[in-house]
């Protein structure tokens, strides 16, 4: 399954969401800085289009869920979170429409769901982040920043092994 | 903190083009835009493009469109700005600013004489 | 596009003196406006960014203030060193750009 041109212009238009819904200086949020410790070799070691495709669905759908939220819509604006929804549910199309053209319907890898709880458990540090820090707009802001980080590097390994194949 | 370094000073001839790096030690570079601003002698300051680098490519000042690339590599969080056609009234001190206000470089002296 | 203009051009006072510089744009401004401080020679300071929330390490005697299109940058009572010029500044997120005021000179009376 080739994800469509689209899929890759959906994902830029993701980053430029994520970028104009910054409300505040990260100068005054420096000391709520935070590693989240994305697992990135998770996307590196899914060496196949077949077992990429489940990983970055997850990784999609837990940023759709941490954006989803009540807190979440308090935080940032609207306008530009509904059509930051919009990306991410084309996104999830996309991806699940790979799926049920067969990619990855076989028996799943056990490495594949280790990949996905790795990708949920980073998520759970996420939430349990913001829920510390009280959501306030500090804490916003560095996860913004971290899932703009995150979603970038998940989606060029995307991109690399599309043109490896 | 985060430090931003800049390249030394330039001298250069009319015609040509000068790149000056920036790189920046410390902090989240891929995501917080890397603008360039410049301030010829006895002048005000004057923006001149600006990048994203996760998401690209560059955005630049009308004025400077045609000569000017602005680029950056991740992997050793360095930021680039390349000024082609230099004229005479380019002579300017060029800075790098982190798009949080705060962050700016020391500064890097292009200075174009024949 | 959006344009910043500053006044007064140039501000004569004595020290002591209270200073009230403004910036007017020429749209709606969100957050990200900022003012910086910059001496000849020197790479300009951040004062003052988001409008009215103090950097570090910049004293008590400048504010900022203001919203939509007025903002102001005020020094309570000059001293020696705030001789200088101020500019301010504004952000856009995307596409990522800076747009600055033409500068106003601070200079001793």
């Known amino acids: 399954c080739d994800l469509p041109q689209t899929h890759s212009l959906g994902s830029r238009r993701t980053l430029m969401l994520l970028a104009q819904m910054r409300r505040i200086s990260l100068f005054s949020c420096l000391k709520d800085r935070h590693d989240f410790g994305f697992p990135q070799e998770e996307f590196g070691n899914q060496f196949q289009k077949a077992e990429t495709i489940p990983v970055l669905h997850e990784m999609i759908q837990q940023i759709f869920n941490l954006f989803s939220t009540k807190d979440s819509s308090a935080a940032w604006d609207e306008t530009l979170l509904d059509k930051f929804y919009t990306e991410l549910y084309q996104q999830l199309n996309d991806l699940e429409a790979c799926v049920i053209q067969g990619v990855g319907v076989t028996e799943t890898p056990l490495m594949k769901e280790d990949s996905i709880l790795a990708v949920r458990k980073y998520f759970q540090r996420i939430t349990l982040y913001l829920k510390e820090k009280k959501y306030s707009p500090c804490a916003w802001e560095v996860v913004r920043a971290e899932i703009m980080r995150s979603f970038s590097l998940s989606t060029n390994l995307q991109e690399s092994l599309r043109s490896k194949e | 903190q985060v430090q931003l370094v800049q390249s030394g000073a330039e001298m250069k001839k009319p015609g040509s083009s000068v790149k000056v790096s920036c790189k920046d030690f410390g902090g989240t570079f891929s995501v917080y835009g890397v603008n360039w601003v410049r301030q010829a002698p006895g002048q005000g300051l004057e923006w001149m493009g600006g990048?994203?680098?996760?998401?690209?490519?560059?955005n630049y000042a009308q004025k400077f469109q045609g000569r000017i690339t602005i680029t950056a590599d991740e992997s050793t969080s360095t930021a680039y700005m390349e000024l082609s056609s230099l004229r005479f009234d380019d002579t300017a001190i060029y800075y790098c600013?982190?798009?949080?206000?705060?962050?700016w470089g020391q500064g890097t002296l292009v200075t174009v004489s024949s | 596009e959006m344009v910043l203009t500053q006044s007064p051009a140039t501000l004569s006072l004595s020290p002591g003196e209270r200073a009230t510089l403004s910036c007017r744009a020429s749209q709606t401004v969100s957050t990200f406006l900022a003012w910086y401080q910059q001496k000849p020679g020197q790479v300009p300071r951040l004062l003052v960014y988001?409008?009215?929330s103090r950097a570090n390490g910049t004293p008590a005697r400048f504010s900022g203030g203001g919203s939509g299109t007025d903002f102001t940058l005020t020094i309570s009572s000059l001293e020696l060193e705030d001789f200088a010029v101020y500019y301010c500044?504004?952000?856009?997120?995307?596409?990522?750009?800076?747009?600055f005021g033409g500068g106003t000179r601070v200079e001793i009376k």
């Open positions: 600013v982190r798009d949080d206000n705060e962050y």
């Open positions: 500044q504004w952000r856009s997120n995307w596409p990522p750009s800076l747009t």
């Open positions: 988001d409008i009215s």
């Open positions: 990048l994203i680098p996760v998401i690209g490519p560059a």
